[in-house]
């Protein structure tokens, strides 16, 4: 990994004690100042592995509310607009991390989760499994 | 919002100033128990989208290392393997938040942080505009 | 906002060549493509010719390949379609379009007519 030096002027927060913990300023920044209006507000409509977006609320957890994808079809919509099953939709996952509330009910002390999200699918050719 | 009962056993880190700051358990909870090895491993290859990884590497973010998806195509892939300029590869997009050290260089100090990750790519019909 | 001017269509005799323009401005995408689409009475629209902006790959209809030729000039932000041998199959309204990823921006066409 990359050392970094230590900023003299950093709070004196470290604690030997494992697990470790850190202080975070909730005040979040938006780095997205680029970010394009069209950019994929209604591709869930518009793909050929079209999928619907299912609202996820935890009190205990930050974000509390995280959307989830999950496609429409087993198949992906073909020219014609019909269903073809010689394709599969498949839902793009990616890991995110979440602030959850430990010990809970907590305002002000959270531990980093590890969570899976469905953000959207996509069409694949599916891969034939010979069985006996 | 949902108001949650405050745990009479949480740490007094209240602080009254805003921006708010709180404490936060680095050894991070994998929720992730259930996930299927074969999830989404290799759909970048097999999608009529197909998209490329880039590693994002910042020393100053937890995490420091994200993959940013980029298409491989304008158009998507037909049936015959070749391009088709009828449809287009689209990225889609998700908000995740990263923990920015701050001050720099600090190891115990941190800003949530927004920022826009490309997870994969889908199949879409463009939307056509009509110019002057 | 993208803009699309085109010229070069005309009236021409079969065999004969005709050179389609087209200058787009505003585009701000790195990844796009330009092209031709032409639609003749009665018929759908088609995706005639296209060359990918990052890469100058070219794409063609069955219906033009060995005939037309499309390139672009970058420095002048002109996209051209140079159209040989030309039959009375290739009349039609001729479209230029700029494409960018979910997007395709059309302008209002130039007609291309073809007499025997």
């Known amino acids: 990994g990359i050392t970094i030096p230590r900023n003299p002027g950093c709070p004196n927060s470290e604690d030997k004690n494992f697990p470790r913990t850190v202080m975070v300023n909730l005040n979040i920044h938006n780095r997205n100042t680029n970010t394009n209006p069209k950019r994929s507000s209604d591709y869930y409509n518009r793909s050929t592995s079209p999928w619907n977006l299912h609202r996820n609320e935890d009190p205990e957890r930050y974000p509390s509310v995280i959307w989830e994808a999950k496609c429409r079809h087993l198949g992906c919509i073909n020219a014609d607009g019909n269903v073809d099953y010689h394709m599969n939709s498949v839902p793009i996952q990616q890991e995110i991390l979440v602030l959850r509330r430990e010990p809970p009910h907590c305002p002000n002390s959270f531990r980093l989760e590890k969570i899976l999200v469905s953000v959207g699918c996509t069409c694949v050719t599916p891969i034939v499994h010979h069985v006996a | 919002g949902i108001t949650i009962p405050r745990n009479p056993g949480c740490p007094n880190s209240e602080d009254k100033n805003f921006p708010r700051t709180v404490m936060v358990n680095l050894n991070i909870h994998n929720r992730n128990t259930n996930t299927n090895p074969k999830r989404s491993s290799d759909y970048y290859n097999r999608s009529t989208s197909p998209w490329n990884l880039h590693r994002n590497e910042d020393p100053e973010r937890y995490p420091s290392v994200i993959w940013e998806a980029k298409c491989r195509h304008l158009g998507c892939i037909n049936a015959d393997g070749n391009v088709d300029y009828h449809m287009n590869s689209v990225p889609i997009q998700q908000e995740i938040l990263v923990l920015r050290r701050e001050p720099p260089h600090c190891p115990n100090s941190f800003r949530l942080e927004k920022i826009l990750v490309s997870v994969g790519c889908t199949c879409v019909t463009p939307i056509v505009h009509h110019v002057a | 906002q993208v803009q699309l001017v085109e010229s070069g269509g005309g009236l021409v005799k079969a065999g004969g060549s005709l050179r389609l323009s087209c200058v787009v401005s505003?585009?701000?995408?790195?990844?796009?493509?330009m092209g031709w689409y032409r639609q003749a009475p009665g018929k759908q629209r088609e995706l005639v010719a296209l060359?990918?902006?990052?890469?100058?790959?070219?794409h063609y209809s069955d219906s033009v390949k060995g005939r037309f030729s499309i390139s672009r000039d970058n420095a002048k932000n002109t996209m051209y379609l140079q159209m040989n041998s030309l039959n009375p199959d290739d009349t039609a309204v001729y479209y230029c379009?700029?494409?960018?990823?979910?997007?395709?921006?059309m302008a209002q066409g130039t007609q291309v007519t073809v007499s025997s």
């Open positions: 060359i990918t902006s990052r890469s100058g790959d070219t």
């Open positions: 379009v700029h494409n960018e990823p979910g997007h395709l921006y």
């Open positions: 505003g585009h701000t995408s790195e990844i796009s493509a």
